[in-house]
Interface confidence: low
């Protein structure tokens, strides 16, 4: 060993005076002369190109060219390689360390607030984490020791820029403006793309990204790449940011972030972002199931391990709150799974954003932008082939859960594409094969990862999936700052935290209700309605008296039909009253002359056959509602396309008489004939099926008015603008929220624990063309249509101005989890 030492370049690199055993040299020219010592390459050359320590490097003489140091003074000089302590000083590495060593919070002096690191690995689909866990020891350790969700839902379209910016603003793409990686804004008359400088124009970027939220509240923020971080949003950049350069090695990115953590307290950021292009790049190139992706996962895992090791070296591994997530997933595409517009149009005289989330607009912009006939394009693309692999939509008709309509950059024609398919202009597009993303955010292949670890997070926990709009509020809570207004629901991720920072409370009711009182059993105005079955005033008086409930009857109906409390009205100045019936309760909106909501509980019926028809052609005035606030039966004669539907289905009756409680004008809502067919099938068949499977369901349903398609209830004047010749406003959508007990041994009204929800928001359209139902029985398309328009309870609340579940005895944060839950039925990945 002594000889070896004498012939070694250890601590002698580039020392021109050194002569080793047999006169070997370690100077810069030794290679040319051929007299280098045996370890010159490993010790002096290779060590300057690596980010790690090894037995050759420990105690090395400091080399200027080194990326990081393993010299004995590197801790003092703060330039050690991330693994110096574990390799050179024998400390346990972060990877080998036991989970349990994390105490409450282990922050060194000067770290009063645990820093937050937001780390994105582009295109890391959730399934990778389970399939390739053994190949990713560092990320898998984070998953084991910290908290993770089964997956995190990306926003639509499941693209890089929209989702990265959603994560840091809590806003939907329609709200923050980055609605795709490529887009046109007619007001700016400019095109945005990832390859043009235009992407750095602040006019594209709305909302308040996390770095600004932190900075506005006295904290510093550093971004090592993040979409938007190089843009002067609201006139400001992050405190520290790096101009995007995809060729910067991951280790260099990590090393720089660790250096930022070494800054003096006054200069040190509290919020950091880190972005890796992988595994997205490899996923595009080879598809999600490929050797390239496996290799990329090992690369990002190694770099992530370097970060954790570097944190441990600084004693920050149990101080920093780190969130590791992705923007979206990845799916395989095929060159034989292409839809070409040339198969649908003789001539392509429009501009198409091609791929998994296509949009179509005028070719000639801005000149033809507003005059472009989007309706005609959708008509020409609807129900054209039996095996069509996309559905065309006008954006206001897209499922409301997507929140993808209210922005001038979102072109009016949208194609919702089947998994693994691409829609393009013509066969000249050969951009296929490999992987892609952008698809429906319910597809399992589009699911992203979410893992978190740190003093604020629970340990060794798996949580239910949630949406990436919720991450911004979570990060604000970690930094103990106030979030800017956003689309997330603050408090809905409190279950991720050991000690929640923000305790939500139920919204306060804005418009108080009254009770529509019963005065006279005979109406002062029959509202042009007829019910031949009620042949005289005595019979009419008898059925109307059924509407005059005693206090005991009111208490009973509330217990059964409003088991979680009356929906609270959060709209301003809404004159509304409660109408109690034995089998349902409704909230009547006087200005709209129709029920705002109706609530009833369908028990588990022994018989699951469809409900019988009700007494035909029987409608009458509700004696509790003044004629001036009621619809008239004559309204429905004026527009032959519109008929009336019932919010509470009269056929769901416990006695033959009780159907008369539902055959009243206050239970009526305007419906297109074609829509009503679907509505009636849902209530007579599917609802009974759900009630049977779930031991009863509570149903709350009602109309929605969202003419300006912004995902929020319309102001009264907005609705008034759209009243046609019928004098009654026509809803743009109808909602149905089904609630049952998660523990199916309990009925909804006696549910002690968690609830199960199934909310739908169905566009109210004059035709059912969305389902291509021609020649098909309802059984083949209605359920699929409802499922396509599944939503969150929160989406219903925003569209109606109602607030649900206020009387459910459960912490508000748990109620918010329920309200932000999106049921999914996807099984294929």
């Amino acid at each position: 060993r002594k000889l070896e030492k004498q012939g070694s370049c250890r601590k002698k690199c580039f020392d021109a005076s050194f002569r080793g055993l047999e006169n070997c040299r370690c100077d810069v020219a030794c290679k040319d002369r051929g007299d280098c010592c045996w370890d010159f390459e490993d010790t002096c050359v290779a060590s300057t190109r690596i980010w790690t320590c090894n037995k050759f490097r420990c105690g090395e003489t400091r080399l200027e060219a080194s990326l990081c140091s393993c010299s004995d003074d590197c801790l003092q000089r703060k330039d050690c390689c991330a693994d110096y302590k574990s390799v050179c000083q024998g400390e346990t590495s972060w990877l080998e360390e036991n989970c349990d060593t994390a105490q409450q919070s282990q922050c060194p002096e000067g770290f009063d607030l645990p820093p937050v690191i937001l780390f994105s690995m582009d295109g890391f689909r959730a399934e990778y984490l389970y399939t390739w866990d053994t190949l990713m020891p560092n990320i898998n350790k984070l998953k084991t020791c910290g908290i993770h969700s089964k997956y995190m839902r990306a926003m639509y379209p499941t693209k890089t820029f929209p989702n990265h910016y959603t994560i840091v603003t809590g806003l939907y793409p329609e709200s923050h403006g980055i609605i795709d990686n490529n887009m046109y804004d007619v007001n700016l008359n400019k095109n945005f793309s990832l390859s043009s400088e235009e992407q750095n124009n602040p006019a594209w970027w709305h909302g308040q990204p996390m770095w600004l939220t932190a900075m506005y509240q006295g904290l510093k923020a550093a971004t090592y790449f993040w979409p938007g971080s190089e843009v002067a949003i609201n006139g400001s950049f992050p405190s520290i940011y790096m101009p995007y350069n995809r060729s910067v090695p991951y280790e260099e990115r990590i090393s720089t972030l660790l250096k930022w953590l070494d800054l003096p307290k006054a200069e040190r950021p509290s919020f950091y972002t880190m972005y890796f292009e992988e595994p997205d790049s490899s996923g595009h190139a080879g598809g999600p199931v490929s050797a390239r992706v496996i290799k990329a996962l090992q690369v990002v895992d190694h770099a992530f391990g370097m970060l954790m090791e570097g944190l441990k070296q600084r004693n920050l591994h149990n101080c920093v709150n780190i969130i590791l997530l992705a923007d979206h997933g990845m799916d395989q595409t095929y060159c034989n799974k292409m839809e070409y517009m040339t198969d649908y149009f003789p001539r392509i005289n429009f501009y198409m954003y091609e791929g998994p989330a296509p949009r179509i607009r005028a070719f000639n912009v801005p000149h033809d932008f507003f005059s472009f006939n989007s309706e005609e394009i959708v008509r020409n693309l609807s129900c054209r082939k039996p095996d069509q692999h996309f559905k065309p939509y006008l954006t206001p008709d897209l499922p409301k859960r997507l929140h993808y309509a209210k922005n001038v950059r979102i072109d009016k024609v949208h194609l919702f594409v089947d998994r693994q398919w691409l829609a393009v202009g013509s066969k000249s597009n050969t951009n296929c094969g490999g992987g892609n993303h952008g698809y429906n955010n319910e597809f399992r292949s589009m699911e992203a990862i979410f893992l978190a670890h740190g003093p604020s997070f629970k340990e060794k926990t798996e949580v239910e999936p949630f949406e990436n709009i919720e991450v911004y509020n979570l990060m604000c809570d970690l930094l103990r700052i106030q979030p800017a207004p956003n689309n997330g629901t603050r408090g809905s991720l409190n279950h991720l935290l050991k000690v929640p920072f923000y305790e939500p409370s139920h919204a306060e009711e804005v418009s108080k209700f009254s009770v529509c009182g019963f005065a006279n059993p005979l109406p002062t105005d029959n509202l042009s309605c007829l019910c031949p079955h009620l042949q005289n005033s005595i019979q009419l008086e008898q059925v109307n008296q059924m509407l005059n409930l005693t206090q005991e009857e009111i208490t009973a109906t509330v217990k059964v039909n409003l088991p979680f409390g009356r929906p609270r009205v959060l709209q301003k100045n809404v004159d509304n009253c409660l109408l109690y019936h034995r089998e349902y309760v409704s909230g009547f909106g006087k200005a709209m002359r129709m029920p705002m909501w109706s609530s009833y509980t369908v028990p588990q019926l022994g018989d699951t056959s469809p409900l019988p028809p009700t007494v035909p052609d029987c409608l009458r005035a509700d004696v509790r509602v003044p004629p001036s606030e009621s619809q008239k039966c004559s309204f429905y004669l004026a527009d032959e396309n519109i008929t009336h539907g019932f919010l509470y289905p009269p056929a769901i009756n416990r006695t033959s008489d009780s159907q008369y409680d539902a055959l009243i004008m206050s239970n009526l809502v305007p419906m297109y004939e074609e829509f009503r067919k679907m509505w009636d099938y849902f209530h007579s068949v599917l609802l009974i099926k759900h009630a049977t499977e779930r031991n009863g369901v509570n149903v709350v349903s009602g109309p929605i008015f969202d003419y300006n398609y912004d995902g929020h209830f319309d102001a009264p004047e907005e609705i008034t603008k759209h009243i046609a010749n019928t004098d009654i406003p026509i809803p743009t959508h109808y909602f149905v929220v089904l609630t049952s007990c998660k523990n199916k041994s309990h009925t909804p009204e006696n549910c002690p624990g968690w609830l199960d929800v199934l909310p739908f928001i169905i566009p109210h359209r004059p035709t059912n063309v969305e389902s291509c139902p021609e020649g098909k029985p309802e059984a083949l398309w209605v359920e699929e249509r409802f499922t396509a328009h599944i939503a969150r309870v929160r989406d219903v609340e925003l569209l109606t101005g109602l607030d649900f579940y206020q009387d459910k005895a459960q912490p508000v944060s748990e109620i918010l989890q329920l309200k932000t839950y999106l049921p999914t039925f996807e099984t294929t990945i």
């Epitope: 509240q217 700052i481 106030q482 800017a484 207004p485 409370s505 301003k572 100045n573 102001a715 009264p716 004047e717 907005e718």
Partner: antibody, heavy 119, light 107 residues
């Protein structure tokens, strides 16, 4: 651009009546509450009351209830503050302000109307 | 009625200083608080709503924080145009009430 433009300065004698106005533009006037705020010379701001022009629903501060009347004419996008019998203590600057549609905070203010009551 | 107490009632500061004004509510008002700036002879101008959200067009040197009963308005680096009187106002319950104001003067 959202704007509230108030009527000009008024000089009145005690006991006289007065109606000052606040005209909104650049937004749907009927959809936002309009509030009135008093500022006596050298003093702070006092909330008097507000009106929802859509249905003329009003709310008053107990200190001003019965002293003033708030009204609105949504057809001409104008809100009013009126006195049936002025007192010297009504001498002040009066501001109208729009309440934000979502947050209820006063986001846009009129330029103010000076009312001087002196014999 | 909810009383809003502002402190200090006046302060002297120099350009570039960090200035903090506090506002205390006599009972919890969640984050239903706004801050206004008023210059002599001018109408108040909205700076912050919902305790911490910046009105559009307001410079980022202004920030608000707090919830419940204690609130703060911070000017991170005072500019010449910031010398004015600042008011807080609660809009959690009726009647709406303002703080007494804080006059920021040139030192």
């Amino acid at each position: 651009e959202v704007q509230l433009v108030q009527s000009g300065a008024e000089v009145k004698k005690p006991g006289e009546s007065l109606k000052i106005s606040c005209k909104g533009s650049g937004y749907r006037f009927a959809s936002n509450w309009i509030g009135w705020v008093r500022q006596m010379p050298g003093k702070g701001l006092e909330w008097m009351g507000e009106i929802y022009p859509g249905d003329s629903n009003t709310r008053y501060s107990p200190s001003f209830q019965g002293q003033v009347t708030i009204s609105a004419d949504k057809s001409i996008s104008t809100a009013y503050l009126q006195w049936s019998s002025l007192k010297a203590s009504d001498t002040a600057m009066y501001y109208c302000a729009r309440k934000d549609y979502y947050y209820y905070a006063m986001d846009v203010w009129g330029q103010g109307t000076t009312v001087t009551v002196s014999s | 009625d909810i009383q809003m107490t502002q402190s200090p009632s006046s302060l002297s500061a120099s350009v570039g200083d960090r200035v903090t004004i506090t506002c205390r509510a006599s009972q919890g008002i969640r984050t239903n608080l706004a801050w206004f700036q008023q210059k002599p002879g001018k109408a108040p101008k909205s700076l912050i709503y919902a305790a911490s959200s910046l009105q559009s067009g307001v410079p980022s040197r202004f920030s608000g924080s707090g919830s419940g009963t204690d609130f703060t308005l911070t000017i991170s680096s005072l500019q010449p145009e910031d010398f004015a009187t600042y008011y807080c106002q609660q809009y959690n319950s009726y009647p709406r009430t303002f703080g007494g104001g804080t006059k920021v003067e040139i030192k």
